[in-house]
Interface confidence: medium
């Protein structure tokens, strides 16, 4: 099978993965989009998804995952906050387009999370300043149960990743759990 391209992100525990998935503006603007993890030999598992239809720039929070869909720019922003070593694995953005199979947005994300917090400020570290806490009312969308077997093209290395359950909430008692801006567009 064809090997899909991967973009590698190496981060430390407590940091934030912040990626953008581009899509064709007009065609997919209001389509429901999802963030999935691909485990060894399994079908992709949906961890979070936007609403249906997808609302413009309306943050959707599922545990430690925040999705924002910028219709004007054809851009899905995905953030995973307070990363844990167990979050390491292969991820992808997809667009749901029933009754057809989900459309995968390249590239896949190879996330490697290591122990220990880096000492120098960086784009993936949270700060006590200029933070914007997502209110508890932030939307939680229901995700379709189906996934496409065709999106599994090659078994990635074994991962023990177990990203937060859909019902888990972000604990804002720790600075590394704070959601940063911008949740607005």
């Amino acid at each position: 099978a064809t090997k899909l391209t991967e973009e590698k992100y190496e981060l430390k525990e407590g940091q934030t993965l912040d990626v953008k998935c581009d899509y064709t503006l007009e065609k997919f603007a209001s389509s429901q989009k999802a963030w999935q993890i691909i485990r060894d030999g399994e079908m992709p598992k949906t961890l979070a998804c936007t609403e249906r239809p997808s609302k413009n720039s309306h943050p959707v929070q599922v545990g430690r995952i925040i999705l924002e869909d910028y219709h004007d720019h054809g851009l899905l922003r995905v953030r995973m906050v307070n990363l844990q070593v167990e979050d390491s694995g292969l991820y992808q953005c997809v667009i749901y387009q029933p009754p057809k199979e989900p459309h995968m947005l390249f590239d896949r994300i190879r996330l490697v999370v290591t122990k220990g917090f880096s000492g120098t400020p960086g784009s993936n570290e949270n700060s006590t300043q200029n933070v914007y806490k997502i209110p508890p009312t932030t939307t939680k969308a229901l995700c379709p149960l189906y996934t496409s077997p065709r999106t599994v093209t090659q078994a990635p290395p074994k991962s023990t990743a177990d990203v937060s359950t859909p019902d888990s909430e972000i604990n804002l008692t720790n600075v590394t759990d704070i959601i940063r801006v911008p949740v607005f567009n």
Partner: antibody, heavy 117, light 107 residues
Framework: QVQLVQSGAEVKKPGSSVKVSCNPS????????ISWVRQAPGQGLEWMGG????????NYAQKFQGRVTITADESTSPGYLELSSLRSEDTAVYYC??????????WGQGTLVTVSS | DIQMTQSPSSVSASVGDRVTITCRAS??????LAWYQHKPGKAPKLLIY???SLQSGVPSRFSGSGSGTDFTLTISSLQPEDFATYYC?????????FGGGTKVEIK
């Protein structure tokens, strides 16, 4: 085509307040955020603050904290910028802009605020 | 606050020239950077968003690159209407901050 229409030029005395409005054509800001950016004569662009109508919580640049109030509502328009305790260095063109993490794609035409005694 | 340092502050160029403007963030901002063109008496115009994505309606001679702390705006072949001031702006965290601007003047 989205248009942001701002209120007209203002001349104010030092110590007073000014309130500038920003009206999105075709209704409300809805899920779009509004930011305010200013440019003083001979200076660059300066972000003052912004608000997401979904949450109603504004974020301000430290420089303007306590002097500026930005309001916008999901169900009503326009949005407003209110700046108090005006001083001469607040003389500038004030722009409202729609956008956030992916830049400001739409801008108002600008409102000149002159602070003079 | 994240400081955005733009260079050069001004550049003199001729029509057809390739112009490169750089922007450096005081800390990493992933790819959350925008570039604007600003002309006197007009509102700024968004050229590039998310560091490298061309805004709809903007000519392809404009391009952006970079991520983390170092970013570049390139005008591949300067046109008469491109003489203006260009600003970068980080949209990674509040407060959003602009670079000091680069004025592109006629040589």
């Amino acid at each position: 085509q989205v248009q942001l229409v701002q209120s007209g030029a203002e001349v104010k005395k030092p110590g007073s307040s000014v309130k500038v409005s920003c009206n999105p054509s075709g209704g409300t800001f809805s899920t779009y955020a509004i930011s305010w950016v200013r440019q003083a004569p001979g200076q660059g662009l300066e972000w003052m603050g912004g608000i997401n109508p979904i949450f109603g919580t504004a974020n301000y640049a430290q420089k303007f904290q306590g002097r500026v109030t930005i309001t916008a509502d999901e169900s009503t328009s326009p949005g407003y910028l209110e700046l108090s305790s005006l001083r001469s260095e607040d003389t500038a063109v004030y722009y409202c802009a729609r956008g956030g993490a992916v830049g400001f794609a739409y801008w108002g035409q600008g409102t000149l605020v002159t602070v003079s005694s | 606050d994240i400081q955005m340092t733009q260079s050069p502050s001004s550049v003199s160029a001729s029509v057809g020239d390739r112009v490169t403007i750089t922007c450096r963030a005081s800390q990493g901002i992933s790819s959350w950077l925008a570039w604007y063109q600003h002309k006197p008496g007009k509102a700024p115009k968004l050229l590039i968003y998310a560091a490298s994505s061309l805004q709809s309606g903007v000519p392809s001679r404009f391009s952006g690159s970079g991520s983390g702390t170092d970013f570049t705006l390139t005008i591949s072949s300067l046109q008469p209407e491109d003489f203006a001031t260009y600003y970068c702006q980080q949209a990674n965290s509040f407060p959003f901050t602009f670079g000091g601007g680069t004025k592109v003047e006629i040589k």
